[in-house]
Interface confidence: medium
């Protein structure tokens, strides 16, 4: 059985479209599961992995490897 584009698995009922945009950063494996691109995490691969050591409480990032501090916090790791 040949599945339509972006459909995978037995019965072709698993849907996955690779994307690299605001809504996710992932490829699809042979079973239609999302595999996050380097630097991204989460079920939709839309959460950037911040700079190693970045404070999870006082820092965040829009892009992988970044560490943006909340107001009132500073330093390389916002700690």
């Amino acid at each position: 059985v040949t599945c339509d584009d972006y459909y995978y698995g037995f019965g072709c009922n698993k849907f996955c479209r690779p994307r690299d945009d605001f809504f996710g950063h992932y490829a699809c494996d042979q079973n239609g599961n999302k595999t996050c691109m380097e630097g991204w995490m989460g079920p939709e691969c839309n959460r950037a992995i911040c700079r190693q050591g970045c404070s999870p409480k006082h820092g965040s990032c829009k892009l992988p490897g970044d560490c943006r501090c909340q107001y009132g916090w500073q330093g390389l790791y916002c700690d």
Partner: antibody, heavy 119, light 107 residues
Framework: QVQLVQSGAEVKKPGSSVKVSCKAS????????MHWVRQAPGQGLEWMGA????????AYAQKFQGRVTITADKSTSTAYMELSSLRSEDTAVYYC????????????WGQGTLVTVSS | DIQMTQSPSSLSASVGDRVTITCRAS??????LAWYQQKPGKAPKLLIY???TLADDVPSRFSGSGSGTDYTLTISSLQPEDFATYYC?????????FGGGTKLEIK
């Protein structure tokens, strides 16, 4: 289970701003972007924009660019939509909505917030 | 931006009828299409996603089909609770636009 609970109805004057909140529960808030959709009385649905709560990245429909600001507070799992320079045409029900799992579109919706713009 | 054109804008039908609503995208949306049902004063409810997959707890009388730019929602045998407004929406790329809606009324 996933729940999105919005703030109450608002009446605003033309030229002012409104800020609608959407409190999420039943899932990890930072895992999914939160979208905002509005519906004017008797009209269709209009996508306004979205935010990635984890990092704060936003995407806006061009129509609302510069007038809408979507923010998120991770500590309270709450998303906000602020619309400025209000005019009578902005009278609408504003919904927050979230995608489902596995690339569903909008599977979860707030109850809606009616914003009335009137002098 | 991709525009969604939905037809008809309104439709009168009777219980037991088979009803078809169509949606045309201005570009190829690769099955990234959803259908919603909305009743007065309520938030929309997801019926179908990825053009043909039924959402949880949606009766099997609803079905979706199509590909490329043309998509269809079919209700095989109308029930009284199906009288509502239906919207299509693409989610291929932002902005995720909706069709104008189809109001399904009792004949």
């Amino acid at each position: 289970q996933v729940q999105l609970v919005q703030s109450g109805a608002e009446v605003k004057k033309p030229g002012s701003s409104v800020k609608v909140s959407c409190k999420a529960s039943g899932y990890t808030f930072t895992d999914y972007e939160m979208h905002w959709v509005r519906q004017a009385p008797g009209q269709g649905l209009e996508w306004m924009g979205a935010i990635q709560p984890g990092g704060g990245g936003t995407a806006y429909a061009q129509k609302f660019q510069g007038r809408v600001t979507i923010t998120a507070d991770k500590s309270t799992s709450t998303a906000y939509m602020e619309l400025s320079s209000l005019r009578s045409e902005d009278t609408a029900v504003y919904y927050c909505t979230r995608r489902g799992y596995d690339d569903y579109p909008f599977a979860y919706w707030g109850q809606g917030t009616l914003v009335t713009v009137s002098s | 931006d991709i525009q969604m054109t939905q037809s008809p804008s309104s439709l009168s039908a009777s219980v037991g009828d088979r009803v078809t609503i169509t949606c045309r995208a201005s570009g190829n949306i690769h099955n990234y299409l959803a259908w919603y049902q909305q009743k007065p004063g309520k938030a929309p409810k997801l019926l179908i996603y990825n053009a043909k997959t039924l959402a949880d707890d949606v009766p099997s009388r609803f079905s979706g089909s199509g590909s490329g730019t043309d998509y269809t929602l079919t209700i095989s045998s109308l029930q009284p609770e199906d009288f509502a407004t239906y919207y299509c929406q693409h989610f291929w790329s932002a902005p995720w636009t909706f069709g104008g809606g189809t109001k399904l009324e009792i004949k």
